[in-house]
């Protein structure tokens, strides 16, 4: 025998109290698949969470984070604070990058400036807490006997830190 509940579509539940009639999900609840015996309570986006998508009878609400925070976890289960450029998030909040390190994003960690001398280059632009150094031509390229000056290397595009 076929289960009568299997005929209940998404957005309804199979109401055992009413001879297994398909009843609409009550307000603030949803069922995303057919044949459900209960509807799930809609997620509420409160506090630092804000509503990205309203709950409907067939799908849960989706949250994101208010400005100054970013999502972490499956389905934005957590909101982690942003820091300013030139800072990193520590266990005790946002802290300025130490001298010799930088962070050009609102999240991630402070990373060491590029060591231009490892590539035989000179520092063209000093680094800051927010920006990496820019390496210029090697000292040999700048010597009077050099036939031509190589153009400065473009600033290294740092990869994103793992979050």
């Amino acid at each position: 025998l076929q289960d009568p509940c299997s005929n209940c579509p998404a957005g309804t539940f199979c109401d055992n109290n009413r001879n297994q009639i398909c009843s609409p999900c009550p307000p603030n609840s949803f069922s995303s698949a057919g044949g459900q015996r209960t509807c799930d309570i809609c997620r509420q986006c409160k506090g630092v969470f804000r509503t990205r998508k309203e709950c409907s009878s067939t799908s849960n609400a989706e949250c994101d984070c208010t400005p100054g925070f970013h999502c972490l976890g499956a389905g934005c289960s957590m909101c982690e604070q942003d820091c300013k450029q030139g800072q990193e998030l520590t266990k005790k909040g946002c802290k300025d990058c130490c001298f010799g390190t930088f962070n050009d994003q609102k999240r991630g960690i402070c990373r060491p400036w590029t060591n231009c001398s490892l590539d035989g280059k000179s520092v063209l632009v000093n680094g800051t807490k927010e920006r990496d150094v820019v390496c210029g031509p090697s000292p040999a390229d700048l010597s009077p006997g050099a036939s031509s000056v190589t153009p400065p290397a473009p600033a290294r595009e740092p990869g994103h830190s793992p979050q």
Partner: nanobody
């Protein structure tokens, strides 16, 4: 697959106690430091406590120092948080998190796997 599953949350009166557990699977538990982090309804994530892979080093946020105790049982792949003298401001969803290194401290924020959380409500 790396998984963390918290339990032990609930409703407790101010001044009461709770013990949270976090069961880990999918990685060599003793090789990694672990942390507890919480999110209160109106706030972002707040670090609570961390413990090294061996359990020999522990660190606490000032807000919980002297009231909360972090511990681990590497033979059971389980992390614990004993919470005493609970206050209304401790109300939050508590997450356990795996860190990316064996050692830990109270500065570097390098959690890379999170549990789904357990809710602690402190209210009379």
């Amino acid at each position: 697959e790396v998984q963390l599953l918290e339990s032990g949350g609930g409703l407790v009166q101010p001044g009461g106690s709770l013990r949270l557990s976090c069961e880990a699977s999918g990685f060599t538990f003793s090789s990694y430091a672990m942390s507890w982090v919480r999110q209160a309804p109106e706030k972002g994530l707040e670090w609570v406590s961390s413990i090294s892979g061996s359990g020999g080093s522990t660190f606490y946020a000032d807000s919980v120092k002297g009231r909360f105790t972090i511990s681990r049982d590497n033979s059971k792949n389980t992390l614990y948080l004993q919470m005493n003298s609970l206050r209304a401001e401790d109300t939050a969803v508590y997450y356990c998190a795996k860190e990316g290194t064996t050692e830990t401290d109270d500065y570097h924020y390098n959690m890379d796997v999170w549990g789904q959380g357990t809710t602690v409500t402190v209210s009379s």
